[in-house]
């Protein structure tokens, strides 16, 4: 019996508008109906929660209104988008998947996606 595996891309480059998207895919050992997805940021061995959402299989993934994350789900795949990123937010973003219901609970943690964020150069003043 193999343990649950979570896959995510190794590297993603955020857009000039500070938006980064990546897919978090998990191989489920059971038939989960309720799944929780958490994005964690790891920097200098400190781990912080970026956002989290619980969804029912077949339903849409809903983050809190004030979350910097949005996402969609399709089967065992979650498409995650993180917005409002700046250069200082560059770091390792880990996808954590928990199969919450029905029992038993299962845990899966990805190896992390290194998101690089480059602040755009300010536009030079133009003289007409």
């Amino acid at each position: 019996c193999k343990a649950m595996h979570v896959a995510q891309p190794a590297v993603v480059l955020a857009s000039s508008r500070g938006i980064a998207s990546f897919v978090c895919e998990y191989a489920s050992p059971g038939k989960a109906t309720e799944v929780r997805v958490t994005v964690l940021r790891q920097a200098d061995s400190q781990v912080t929660e970026v956002c989290a959402a619980t969804y029912m299989m077949g339903n849409e993934l809903t983050f809190l209104d004030d979350s910097i994350c949005t996402g969609t789900s399709s089967g065992n795949q979650v498409n995650l988008t993180i917005q409002g990123l700046r250069a200082m937010d560059t770091g390792l973003y880990i996808c954590k998947v928990e199969l919450m219901y029905p029992p038993p609970y299962y845990l899966g943690i990805g190896n992390g996606t290194q998101i690089y964020v480059i602040d755009p150069e300010p536009c030079p003043d133009s003289d007409f």
């Epitope: 019996c1 193999k2 343990a3 649950m4 595996h5 309720e34 929780r36 958490t38 964690l40 781990v47 912080t48 929660e49 989290a52 619980t54 880990i94 954590k96 928990e98 919450m100 219901y101 029992p103 038993p104 609970y105 299962y106 845990l107 899966g108 943690i109």
Partner: antibody
């Protein structure tokens, strides 16, 4: 700093009830699963129950299912364990523990002793 | 349920010794294996999480390895404060389970 402080232990007769509390501070309580773990005198660690995030999903060890109830109050940062139909074999130090954001239980309370004896 | 076994159940060692404790899961738990240290009358303390990650504040003489079903905790050079009982624990699936413990005492 993170702190977990248990209370509510004591001496109780078989068949009676007790309610344990664990007051949490220094972290975002609702972002963490919370566990109860017990240790009988001179024995190893035994996981008792977990309650996740919003308090909806709860899981129990077979040895306590149907007798113990775990709950949490996220507005007051408090974890509870209701112990009913107590037996002599429930005598133990009961610890609350925080599930880290990744894996492992990174902070534990000091423990509260429950003694079931007639 | 996932059963956890540990060996040895106890060992005697001297300060400066290299100590190795093994833990085995009854089925694959990937790397969702944690190690705790417990001293008499005290709460357990997380040493290693996710099989090989050192918990913040834990001395680097502690290290963990393994994945799947077989895991190892190594203390590279035993110090006086390391005499304690060590438990492995799986956090992959409920019911969460601990190993029976390994008591490390002074030779």
């Amino acid at each position: 700093q993170v702190q977990l402080v248990e209370s509510g232990g004591g001496v109780v007769q078989p068949g009676r009830s007790l309610r344990l509390s664990c007051a949490a501070s220094g972290f975002t309580f609702s972002s963490h699963g919370m566990h109860w773990v017990r240790q009988a005198p001179g024995k190893g660690l035994e996981w008792v129950a977990v309650i996740w995030y919003d308090g909806i999903n709860k899981y129990y060890a077979d040895s306590v299912r149907g007798r113990f109830t775990i709950s949490r109050d996220n507005s007051n940062n408090t974890l509870y364990l209701q112990l009913n139909s107590l037996r002599a074999e429930d005598t133990a130090v009961y610890y609350c523990a925080r599930n880290s954001l990744l894996t492992g239980w990174d902070y534990w309370g000091q423990g509260t002793l429950v003694t079931v004896s007639s | 349920d996932i059963q956890m076994t540990q060996s040895p159940s106890s060992l005697s060692a001297s300060v400066g010794d290299r100590v190795t404790i093994t833990c085995r899961a009854s089925q694959s738990i990937s790397s969702y294996l944690n190690w705790y240290q417990q001293k008499p009358g005290k709460a357990p303390k997380l040493l290693i999480y996710a099989a090989s990650s050192l918990q913040s504040g834990v001395p680097s003489r502690f290290s963990g390895s393994g994945s799947g079903t077989d895991f190892t905790l190594t203390i590279s050079s035993l110090q006086p404060e390391d005499f304690a009982t060590y438990y492995c624990q799986q956090s992959y699936s409920t019911p969460f389970t601990f190993g029976p413990g390994t008591k490390v005492d002074i030779k």
